[in-house]
């Protein structure tokens, strides 16, 4: 970067090289060039010469003042106009950064995706800081009181093999950057309560000709968890509102769910599951599209039909087997 150049003087920033976005800052340039009493000192930001708010302080030093500096990063350098020199002489350069101190991390969540061998912890980091911000995830056993710390820039995957202190833990997150430090509330977890079953996948759909045509959705999961609760949501692709159906599921065989749908309409289906009575759901599966026939013939849709979709985490509270609309949308 600009900081690696050979300097014939000194450049510095007040209040600091990393500062809060929106602050007024001063950049100082001091020349120390042999046989040169600088006639002028020039400042450049990202290669563009600065024209305004430059004040000469003394024979060798000038100041560039910025009001309400809002750029996350800038490369600054300064030059001198020396008498009898045709070109400007480089003095020095510096990379400067502006941003925000971290917000208090909240919504700390730790889950174990079945078969992953990891506990995945995530959190809401709050507003963008624009500057390098590190997170330390603290995991403390409530049984042994032993604490482990994990440094990361975003989320963290912790091998379940490293969680040797029993089943109960406290987890909290510390956020820190050059402008400040914040710490989340502590989350208490039990390893058995945070397992999310292996992903449920819709494999195919068929509409069967009957007095009232019905559509059967085939879906499955590789989970070994015995008690699993699932939700399937579906809607016509032209609709905003989802219908949600709830199931208590045993994945020893492929699931078949029946729906009575309008003819000649394209529907989208998604499924998600959780261990019964536990806190965390899977994300909704990839969208599965199925168009119902106009009238009689049998139509089958296969899983390769998936389109890209915004897979949200909408929750529906309904009783088993009943069709309900989830008006919260995505």
């Amino acid at each position: 970067g600009i900081t690696n150049i050979n300097c014939s003087g000194h450049i510095w920033v007040e209040p600091a090289t990393i500062f809060k976005m929106g602050m007024n800052i001063s950049i100082y340039c001091q020349a120390a060039i042999k046989n040169c009493q600088p006639r002028k000192l020039h400042f450049y930001k990202n290669g563009i010469k600065e024209r305004f708010q430059i004040t000469r302080i003394n024979k060798t030093t000038a100041r560039l003042w910025y009001k309400n500096f809002l750029e996350p990063h800038a490369s600054m350098y300064c030059t001198a106009e020396c008498p009898k020199h045709f070109q400007e002489t480089l003095i020095c350069g510096k990379d400067i950064s502006s941003g925000y101190p971290p917000d208090i991390p909240d919504e700390v969540t730790c889950v174990i995706y079945e078969y992953s061998g990891n506990m995945t912890c995530t959190w809401n980091a709050g507003k963008l800081t624009y500057i390098d911000t590190k997170y330390v995830v603290h995991v403390k056993s409530l049984e042994t009181e032993e604490e482990q710390q994990y440094l990361t820039s975003s989320y963290i995957n912790i091998s379940t093999d490293s969680l040797q202190g029993g089943k109960k833990y406290l987890v909290w997150v510390q956020a820190a950057n050059a402008l400040g430090m914040e710490e989340s509330k502590q989350l208490q977890i039990h390893l058995d309560d945070i397992v999310i079953p292996s992903a449920a996948v819709i494999s195919r759909a068929e509409t069967i000709n009957a007095t009232v045509p019905k559509t059967i959705i085939y879906w499955d999961s590789q989970t070994t968890i015995e008690k699993v609760s699932c939700e399937m949501r579906y809607k016509a692709t032209t609709n905003q509102t989802w219908n949600v159906k709830e199931f208590d599921t045993n994945f020893t065989y492929v699931q078949q769910s029946e729906f009575y749908l309008e003819p000649n309409i394209k529907y989208v289906f998604q499924v998600r599951c959780q261990e019964t009575g536990k806190r965390y759901w899977q994300p909704w599966s990839s969208p599965f599209f199925h168009k119902t026939p106009e009238t009689v013939p049998q139509v089958t849709s296969k899983a390769f039909q998936h389109d890209t979709w915004n897979s949200g985490l909408t929750v529906a509270s309904i009783s088993t087997g009943h069709l309900t609309s989830d008006n919260r949308g995505d």
Partner: antibody, heavy 119, light 107 residues
Framework: QVQLVESGGGVVQPGRSLRLSCAAS????????MSWVRQAPGKGLDLVAD??????????YYADSVKDRFTISRDNSKNTLYLQMNSLRAEDTAVYYC??????????WGQGTLVTVSS | DIQMTQSPSSLSASVGDRVTITCRAS??????LAWYQQKPGKAPKLLIY???SLQDGVPSRFSGSGSGTDYTLTISSLQPEDFATYYC?????????FGQGTKVEIK
Amino acid sequence: QVQLVESGGGVVQPGRSLRLSCAASGFDFNSYGMSWVRQAPGKGLDLVADINSKSYDYATYYADSVKDRFTISRDNSKNTLYLQMNSLRAEDTAVYYCAVHHSDYFEYWGQGTLVTVSS
Amino acid sequence: DIQMTQSPSSLSASVGDRVTITCRASQDIYTNLAWYQQKPGKAPKLLIYHASSLQDGVPSRFSGSGSGTDYTLTISSLQPEDFATYYCLQDSEYPPTFGQGTKVEIK
């Protein structure tokens, strides 16, 4: 050799507008700052507006007395400098010179164009 | 902005005289000073830049000196074509600012 030719001056009523032009030749127009300097009758020289060179990203400057009324611009493809003067006042009456600066002093000047604001 | 004060505002002199015009800046301008000559109905003409550098084509009877806040334009032997108004300009800090002018008249 360097040549600067101003045009667009004339007599105008207060509150009206006028656009001055300055056709430049004989130098690399892009690499130089361009200014409008005015001289009221019997008075000294005053920098009115300035548009800097490419190295300054064409930053503009206006004297407080013309801010929000005058606009300086340049067309590098035509080697021409402009001054759009709106809401003209009697005190804007002056000879307007187009000038070139490489450092910050004015190296070359046009012959000037007279603007008279009078009812 | 930096203020420039020229003195005298006018002077009368004869051909062959040595004439000195001074310009004082409100702060140190580190030799970033230019001198201009303007004749009636004409555009200003650059004589001297960087306080003491003579612009190409300008007669050597014109010279400039000074440092810090005080600067001088000297015409060593006044010629008939030198009767004009002279302006100083600081270009140390933006925006550049002119002195109010010195009118050199025939005595």
